[in-house]
């Protein structure tokens, strides 16, 4: 793996220290030919929770052009999943012409949508 | 109880420095973004800068970047600006808040505030 | 930057009376806004989160509503005490902006 990259099941994992918008956060993964994690797993879940800790964090899931997308092209339907209860409710009431389209680890690793401008951290991941 | 309390106002010349502390107590604030807001007089708040928990993320206003460094120091529950070449649009009355979350949650609890006056 | 249009900018009401403040952002912004109260002198007060959420010991006088880009203040009825500016925000994303201020007056 790269410097400052952690390698873990035959990927490698950069953790974001600062905040983006989901958009900028998946750019910056594609600068570094990498992208937004997908978790795959309750195993990566877990190793992926440990290393973010308790903060906001974005990954590779979305739904902006409709049905929710791995970033990488992973099924969607039938992989894995930890939403938090009663998530994602792509709440349509903000008013910023769509739902809440991105999906991020909460405080305690399970995962919701959010409006995709909130400036949270971010995961990229490449497959070795 | 939950406290801020700012200090290092006063009254400086354009083009000098000043460096502003916010004590934290009666909360773990280690846990806590912190914010600066500036109000100069007779106007409305203006967002100078945030701080992550950590220390690990940073974002100014505009009106400050490159001149304004915010820092802080959770082993002495200490939050400071350091404000460097200043102008006189820099006077104001400077508040510390706390975030309600790590850094992206919002003010809840804020200072009384210290006054810093850039005049010749 | 997300620009913050708060209305009226002062307004006068007496003891009792029903207080409404709008705050308009040039974007949305969810609903993620907050309100503060200010007195002369005095530092802010948090008053209102997530556009809707009372922060703790605030009465319940005060509430607010909206999401994406239109939101309201409500003081269901004006006391002597509440006679100061209040304040919008935005807390969606960086910088973080403030409204221009409504300062209600006793009437």
């Known amino acids: 793996c790269p410097v400052n990259w952690v390698e873990h099941e035959r990927s490698c994992y950069w953790f974001s220290r600062s905040g983006k918008a989901w958009a900028d956060a998946d750019n910056y993964c594609r600068l570094e030919d990498a992208h937004l994690v997908v978790v795959t797993s309750w195993e990566e879940q877990k190793f992926v929770q440990h290393h973010i800790g308790p903060v906001n964090t974005w990954m590779g899931l979305h739904d902006q052009n409709g049905p929710w997308k791995w970033v990488d092209g992973t099924d969607y339907e039938t992989g894995f999943k930890n939403w938090r209860p009663e998530q994602p409710d792509d709440w349509y009431g903000h008013g910023l012409g769509g739902g809440e389209d991105c999906a991020h680890f909460t405080d305690d690793g399970r995962w919701n949508d959010d409006v995709c401008q909130r400036p949270y951290r971010w995961v990229c991941e490449t497959e070795l | 109880q939950v406290q801020l309390v700012e200090s290092g106002g006063g009254v400086v010349q354009p083009g000098r420095s000043l460096k502003l502390s916010c004590a934290a107590s009666?909360?773990?604030?280690?846990?806590?973004?912190m914010h600066w807001v500036r109000q100069a007089p007779g106007k409305g708040l203006e967002w100078v800068a945030v701080i992550w928990y950590d220390g690990t993320n940073k974002n100014y206003a505009d009106s400050v970047k490159g001149r304004f460094t915010i820092s802080r120091d959770n082993s002495k529950n200490t939050l400071c600006l350091q404000m460097n070449s200043l102008r006189a649009e820099d006077t104001a009355v400077y508040y510390c808040a706390r975030d309600q979350g790590v850094g992206y949650d919002g003010l809840d609890v804020w200072g009384q505030g210290t006054t810093v006056t850039v005049s010749s | 930057d997300i620009q913050m249009a708060q209305s009226p900018s002062s307004l006068s009401a007496s003891v009792g009376d029903r207080v409404t403040i709008t705050c308009r952002t040039s974007?949305?912004?969810?609903?993620?806004l907050a309100w503060f109260q200010q007195k002369p002198g005095k530092a802010p007060k948090s008053l209102l989160y997530k556009a809707s959420s009372l922060q703790g010991g605030v009465p319940s006088k005060f509430s607010g509503s909206g999401s994406g880009t239109d939101f309201t203040l409500t003081i269901s009825s004006l006391q002597p005490e509440d006679f100061a500016t209040y304040y919008c925000?935005?807390?969606?994303?960086?910088?973080?902006?403030f409204g221009g201020g409504t300062k209600v007056e006793i009437k």
């Open positions: 009666g909360f773990t604030f280690s846990t806590y973004g």
């Open positions: 925000q935005q807390y969606m994303t960086y910088p973080l902006t």
């Open positions: 974007q949305g912004i969810g609903k993620y």
